[in-house]
C-alpha cells in the first residue's frame, strides 16, 4: 500500500498530507488484487494533479472514486476506459480548470460531484451545465467558472455563443424490408461545435457497412435476416456539449417456419405444442388425418408466448379420447410462403382391447382416463366453426 | 462566406422535365448533406428529402419519389434537382438548403420559381 | 388532421410581445421533440430562428436576437415562439417544424402582423 495510505482488500483511503502522494495509488504486484478494490478515497493530497491514462484501468471493479481537497488539475481522456462500474465521482475542491465529457460518456454515472474547481467559461465545460439542467434535482451543485475577465460567474448563467447540443436525423423512408433483401439509411447530423457522427447497430445480424464523412453518413444492410426483426438501429451525433441520438426500429417480412411441432402432453389439457416464426403474422391451419381440423371450444389453437416473431402456443385438447388419435398437420402461412409439419398423436387406446395396447400405435401404453366420446366428438366437419386461428399475442399488437 | 446560388425562374409545359441548380460556396461542398424544399404559392414549406453530398446517395420524403431526382456535381460543388412528367400542381419555388453550424436548415438558396402551364 | 397546427394569422402591436403556437397532432408528445421555428419574409427563403426542447437542449440561430426566444406548453401539447419587444420588421410569416418519423415536417404557417 503506498505511504500515506491505507489498503484493505476492497478499500484504499489516503488522507494523510505528509508525506502525501505524487501520483494515483497504485498496489505493489503481490499484495491485493485489484480487480476486488471498489472504493478510492483520497483527500488532502495537494501534489496530486493528475490521473494518467494508466492509473485507475486495473481497478476495474470500482465503484466510488473520490479525491477531495487535492491538487487535481488534468485527467487523461481514456483514464477511466476500463472501469465501467463506476457510479460515484466526487472531484470537490481540486485545481480543475476544464474536463471532457469524453472522460464519463461510456460510464453509467449516478454521480459526478465537482464543486470547487477553478474551471474556466468555455465550450468545453458547457456539458457539465447540461447534465445539471437536465438531472434539474433539488440538490443542484453551485458550480462556477471563471471568465475572461477572471470574474466567477454561476455555470448556470453560462452563455456560450456556438456551443449547444448537437442534432442527429436517421431517414428511413421504408424500413420495413422482405428477408434477404437490402435497405440503406441516410442520416445527416448537426451542430456547433460541428459534432461527429456515427451509428450503432447493436446486435444486428445481417451483413451492415458504413460510410461516414463528417456530417452526414449511409448505413447498407444487406441480405437482412430474419432475425434482426425488431432491432433498433441508431445515428449518434456527438460534440463537446453532449449527444443526440435518432433510432428506428427493423422490420423485416419473411415466409413462416415451424420451428418445433410436437407429440402432445398433457398438463391441465393436452397440449400439442409448437413454435411458429412468420412476419407478418401467419394464419394457423391445423389439419386431421389429412381433412381440415374446424376449432371449437373443446380443440383450439392456443398462443402462450409471443416473442416478436416467433409464436409458441398449443393446440389444445379438452379431454381427448382414443377418438382423437391421429395425424396431426400444422400450417402455416403469410403473404411470403407457408410450412408445414405433421405429428402423430396418441392421446388413450382403443375401449374394448384388453391387452392394453391400441393396435395402430402397437408399442404405445394406453391409459383409461374415463372420458366419453361425445366430449369431443369428430372435430372434422364442423360447418360453424372457425376454419383458421390467426396469431395474435394477448395485448392485440400487430407485429 | 457560405452561398447557395439556385438557377433562374423556369416556365415548362405539362409533361416537360426541369432542373434545377444549387451552386454552394464558402463551405466544404461534400462534408454537409443538401436539402430540397418546395413551397407551393401562398402555401407553406414542404421538405422533399436530402441528397448525401459525399456518397451521392439520396432520400426523398413521401410523396416526392418517381419524378423527383436529386444529383450532385461535385466537381462544381453544385446540387440538382430534377422533376420529369411536370403537372400543374408542381408549380411552386423550390429552395435548396443546408444545415451547416445550426441544427435547423440555416443556409438557403434564393428559391427557383418553376412555373408548369399549357 | 396535420402533424403540426399553426393559427392562420396574428395580429399585435409595435414594443407588445407575440406569442406563436405550433400544436401537434393529438399522440404526439411535444416532450419528446425539438421545435424548429423558421421566419420567411415576402420574396425571400426561410430563415432559422431558433431550435428548443428544454432550457437544457435549445439554440439560438446565429445572429437572432434573444427577443426571439422557444418556450413549450405541455398542457397544450405546443411549441411555442415568443418575439417580444415586437418590431415592425417582424411582419412576417413564421414556421414550426420537428423531425418526425424520417421526415422534416413544417406546420402549416402563422402570418404576424404588427399593427
Known amino acids: 500500500c503506498p505511504t500515506s495510505c491505507k489498503c484493505s482488500a476492497s478499500r484504499i483511503w489516503c488522507s494523510d498530507p505528509s508525506p502525501g502522494i505524487v501520483a494515483f495509488p497504485r498496489l505493489e504486484p503481490n499484495s491485493v488484487d485489484p480487480e476486488n478494490i471498489t472504493e478510492i478515497f483520497i483527500a488532502n493530497q495537494k501534489r496530486l494533479e493528475i490521473i494518467n491514462e494508466d492509473d485507475v484501468e486495473a481497478y476495474v471493479g470500482l465503484r466510488n472514486l473520490t479525491i477531495v481537497d487535492s491538487g487535481l488539475k488534468f485527467v487523461a481522456h481514456k483514464a477511466f476506459l476500463k472501469n465501467s462500474n463506476l457510479q460515484h465521482i466526487n472531484f470537490t475542491r481540486n485545481k480543475l480548470t476544464s474536463l471532457s465529457r469524453k472522460h464519463f460518456r461510456h460510464l453509467d454515472l449516478s454521480e459526478l460531484i465537482l464543486v470547487g474547481n477553478p474551471f474556466t467559461c468555455s465550450c468545453d465545460i458547457m456539458w457539465i451545465k447540461t447534465l445539471q439542467e437536465a438531472k434539474s434535482s433539488p440538490d443542484t451543485q453551485d458550480l462556477y467558472c471563471l471568465n475572461e475577465s477572471s470574474k466567477n460567474i454561476p455555470l448556470a448563467n453560462l452563455q456560450i455563443p456556438n456551443c449547444g447540443l448537437p442534432s442527429a436525423n436517421l431517414a428511413a423512408p421504408n424500413l420495413t424490408v422482405e428477408e434477404g433483401k437490402s435497405i440503406t439509411l441516410s442520416c445527416s447530423v448537426a451542430g456547433d461545435p460541428v459534432p461527429n457522427m456515427y451509428w450503432d447497430v447493436g446486435n444486428l445480424v445481417s451483413k451492415h457497412m458504413n460510410e461516414t464523412s463528417h456530417t452526414q453518413g449511409s448505413l447498407r444492410i444487406t441480405n437482412i435476416s430474419s432475425d434482426d426483426s425488431g432491432k433498433q438501429i441508431s445515428c449518434v451525433a456527438e460534440n463537446l456539449v453532449g449527444e443526440d441520438q435518432d433510432s428506428v426500429n427493423l422490420t423485416v417480412h419473411f415466409a413462416p417456419t415451424i420451428t418445433f411441432l410436437e407429440s402432445p402432453t398433457s398438463d391441465h389439457h393436452w397440449c400439442i405444442p409448437f413454435t411458429v416464426k412468420g412476419n407478418p403474422k401467419p394464419a394457423l391451419q391445423w389439419f386431421y388425418n389429412g381433412a381440415i381440423l374446424n376449432e371449437s371450444k373443446y380443440i383450439c389453437t392456443k398462443i402462450h408466448v409471443t416473442n416478436h416473431t416467433e409464436y409458441h402456443g398449443c393446440l389444445q385438447l379438452d379431454n381427448p379420447t382414443h377418438m382423437n388419435n391421429g395425424d396431426y398437420t400444422l400450417i402455416a402461412k403469410n403473404e411470403y410462403g407457408k410450412d408445414e409439419k405433421q405429428i402423430s398423436a396418441h392421446f388413450m387406446g382403443w375401449p374394448g382391447i384388453d391387452d392394453g395396447a391400441n393396435p395402430n400405435y402397437p408399442d404405445v401404453i394406453y391409459e383409461d382416463y374415463g372420458t366419453a366420446a361425445n366430449d369431443i366428438g369428430d372435430t372434422t366437419n364442423r360447418s360453424n366453426e372457425i376454419p383458421s386461428t390467426d396469431v395474435t399475442d394477448k395485448t392485440g399488437r400487430e407485429h | 462566406q457560405v452561398q447557395l446560388v439556385q438557377s433562374g425562374s423556369e416556365l415548362k409545359k405539362p409533361g416537360a422535365s426541369v432542373k434545377v441548380s444549387c451552386k454552394a460556396s464558402g463551405y466544404t461542398f461534400t462534408s454537409y448533406a443538401m436539402n430540397w424544399v418546395r413551397q407551393a404559392p401562398g402555401q407553406g414549406l414542404e421538405w422533399m428529402g436530402w441528397i448525401n453530398t459525399n456518397t451521392g446517395n439520396p432520400t426523398y420524403a413521401q410523396g416526392f419519389t418517381g419524378r423527383f431526382v436529386f444529383s450532385l456535381d461535385t466537381s462544381v460543388s453544385t446540387a440538382y434537382l430534377q422533376i420529369s412528367s411536370l403537372k400543374a400542381e408542381d408549380t411552386a419555388v423550390y429552395y435548396c438548403?443546408?444545415?451547416?453550424?445550426?441544427?435547423?436548415?440555416?443556409?438557403w438558396g434564393q428559391g427557383t420559381l418553376v412555373t408548369v402551364s399549357s | 388532421q396535420a402533424v403540426l397546427t399553426q393559427p392562420s394569422s396574428l395580429s399585435a402591436s409595435p414594443g407588445a410581445s407575440a406569442s406563436l403556437t405550433c400544436t401537434l397532432r393529438s399522440g404526439i408528445n411535444v416532450g419528446t421533440y425539438r421545435i424548429y421555428w423558421y421566419q420567411q419574409k415576402p420574396g425571400s427563403p426561410p430563415q432559422y430562428l431558433l431550435r428548443y426542447k428544454s432550457d437544457s437542449d435549445k439554440q439560438q440561430g446565429s445572429g437572432v436576437p434573444s427577443r426571439f426566444s422557444g418556450s413549450k406548453d405541455a398542457s397544450a401539447n405546443a411549441g411555442i415562439l415568443l418575439i417580444s419587444g415586437l418590431r415592425s420588421e417582424d411582419e412576417a410569416d413564421y414556421y414550426c417544424?420537428?423531425?418526425?418519423?424520417?421526415?422534416?415536417?413544417f406546420g402549416g404557417g402563422t402570418q404576424l402582423t404588427v399593427l
Open positions: 417544424a420537428i423531425w418526425h418519423s424520417s421526415a422534416w415536417v
Open positions: 438548403a443546408s444545415r451547416l453550424a445550426a441544427a435547423g436548415f440555416d443556409y
